[in-house]
C-alpha cells in the first residue's frame, strides 16, 4: 500500500479495508484478520461480530464490511440487528414461559412467532362471518345479511385486514 500523499490529513487517502497505521508513519495498512473498516480514513479497524451458538452467520465479515448474524433454524430474531433469538412455535401457537401453547378459542396466530390475536369481530363492520376462524387463521368477513337479499350479489370480496376486534364472532 502506498504512503498517503495528502498534506492536510495523510490518513484521508486510506481506503475502506485499511487503516492509517500510526506505528508505521501513517502508511495505509490492511485490516488484520477478523476486523474491517467500512469507510476510508479510519485510524483503526473494527473487530468483526462473531455469530456463535444460537446465532449463525448470514454474511461473512470482509475487510470492508461487518459480519451479519441471524438465528439458527427453529429460531427467529428479536430486536433490530438480531440481538437475541427466540424459539419458533407452530402456526396456531404462541410462545409462553412454559413453551409453545395452542391459541385459546377465539384467537389465532398465522405465524411461527408472536402472540395469538383475537379473531376479527365482523359485526363491528356490520358484516357477517363468511368463513369461521381457526387457531391458525382469522375469520373471513362477508357481506351483511341485508346485502344478501334477492337481487343483491351473493359474493363480495372479504374485508381488508384490520385490527383484531375485542370479541370473537
Amino acid at each position: 500500500f502506498e504512503r498517503t500523499r495528502s498534506l492536510q490529513d495523510p490518513c484521508s487517502n486510506c481506503p475502506a479495508g485499511t487503516f492509517c497505521d500510526n506505528n508505521r508513519n501513517q502508511i495505509c495498512s490492511p485490516c488484520p484478520p477478523n476486523s474491517f473498516s467500512s469507510a476510508g480514513g479510519q485510524r483503526t479497524c473494527d473487530i468483526c461480530r462473531q455469530c456463535k451458538g444460537v446465532f449463525r452467520t448470514r454474511k461473512e465479515c470482509s475487510s470492508t464490511s461487518n459480519a451479519e448474524c441471524d438465528c439458527t433454524p427453529g429460531f427467529h430474531c428479536l430486536g433490530a440487528g438480531c440481538s437475541m433469538c427466540e424459539q419458533d412455535c407452530k402456526q396456531g401457537q404462541e410462545l409462553t414461559k412454559k413453551g409453545c401453547k395452542d391459541c385459546c378459542f377465539g384467537t389465532f396466530n398465522d405465524q411461527k412467532r408472536g402472540i395469538c390475536r383475537p379473531w376479527t369481530n365482523c359485526s363491528l363492520d356490520g358484516k357477517s362471518v363468511l368463513v369461521n376462524g381457526t387457531k391458525e387463521r382469522d375469520v373471513v368477513c362477508g357481506p351483511s345479511p341485508a346485502d344478501l337479499s334477492p337481487g343483491a350479489s351473493s359474493v363480495t370480496p372479504p374485508a381488508p385486514a384490520r385490527e383484531p376486534g375485542h370479541s370473537p364472532q
Partner: antibody, heavy 115, light 107 residues
Framework: QVQLKQSRPGLVQPSQSLSITCTVS????????VHWIRQPPGKGLEWLGA???????DYNAAFISRLSISKDNSKSQVFFKMNSLQADDTAIYYC?????????WGQGTLVTVSA | NIVMTQSPKSMSMSVGERVTLRCKAS??????VSWYQQKPEQSPKLLIH???NRYTGVPDRFTGSGSATDFTLTISSVQAEDLVDYHC?????????FGAGTKLELK
C-alpha cells in the same frame, strides 16, 4: 417452564478441582447452548465458557488450560469442571441459557476456596 | 478482549429520581450490549438486549440507548426495588465481557 438448577455450594481446598452440574428443564440441550459465568464476591460478572447445542465448546482463553464443559443431552445436564483452584477463584458460579443474551440463569453455586 | 467500563461505581438516590447509568466499550460493539439487574442473593435478570430492546415483562421506566462504544441505562423514576446492582455486558465478540457493575443505593 424454563429452569436451570445447579448443584449445591461447596468448600474447595486450594489446588483441588471444582465440579458443578446444571440440570435444565423446559428446554432441550440439543437445541440450546449453555454458558458458565462467575461472580467473585462484590465484583462483576466474568464469562468462563460455553457448550453449544451440537456439543462443541468455547472457553475464555484465561481459563482454557483448566476448564472443561461437557453435557448429557438425555439427562438434560451440563457439567462444569475447573482444576487447580486458588483463593481468587472464590465466586458464585452460574449457568445460563444461550439466547444471544442471558434471559435464563441458574440460581448460582457459591464456591469458597480455602484451606 | 473488549473491556466494558461502567460508571459510576455506586450512586445514592431518592425514590422518584431519574437516573442514568453508563457503560463504555473499549471497541465498537455495534448495538450488542445487554443490561442486567441483580438483587441481593439473586441471579442477574435481563432488562435490555440489543442496547435498546426492553425484555419481556420489564417495566417501561427502564430505557436503554447508545451504540458503538457508549451505552446508557435510564430509570425514569426510581422505585425502592430498583436500588440494587446493574451490569452491562457485550455479546458482540468472544470472550463475552461485562462491566464491574453499578450499585444504586438509597440516599
Amino acid at each position: 417452564q424454563v429452569q436451570l438448577k445447579q448443584s449445591r455450594p461447596g468448600l474447595v481446598q486450594p489446588s483441588q478441582s471444582l465440579s458443578i452440574t446444571c440440570t435444565v428443564s423446559g428446554f432441550s440441550l440439543s437445541i440450546y447452548g449453555v454458558h458458565w459465568i462467575r461472580q467473585p464476591p462484590g465484583k462483576g460478572l466474568e464469562w468462563l465458557g460455553a457448550i453449544w447445542s451440537g456439543g462443541s465448546t468455547d472457553y475464555n482463553a484465561a481459563f482454557i488450560s483448566r476448564l472443561s464443559i461437557s453435557k448429557d443431552n438425555s439427562k438434560s445436564q451440563v457439567f462444569f469442571k475447573m482444576n487447580s483452584l486458588q483463593a481468587d477463584d472464590t465466586a458464585i458460579y452460574y449457568c445460563a441459557r444461550d439466547d444471544g443474551s442471558f434471559a435464563y440463569w441458574g440460581q448460582g453455586t457459591l464456591v469458597t476456596v480455602s484451606a | 478482549n473488549i473491556v466494558m467500563t461502567q460508571s459510576p461505581k455506586s450512586m445514592s438516590m431518592s425514590v422518584g429520581e431519574r437516573v442514568t447509568l453508563r457503560c463504555k466499550a473499549s471497541e465498537n460493539v455495534g448495538i450488542y450490549v445487554s443490561w442486567y439487574q441483580q438483587k441481593p442473593e439473586q441471579s442477574p435478570k435481563l432488562l435490555i438486549h440489543g442496547a435498546t430492546n426492553r425484555y419481556t415483562g420489564v417495566p417501561d421506566r427502564f430505557t436503554g440507548s447508545g451504540s458503538a462504544t457508549d451505552f446508557t441505562l435510564t430509570i425514569s423514576s426510581v422505585q425502592a426495588e430498583d436500588l440494587v446492582d446493574y451490569h452491562c455486558g457485550q455479546s458482540y465478540s468472544y470472550p463475552l465481557t461485562f462491566g464491574a457493575g453499578t450499585k444504586l443505593e438509597l440516599k
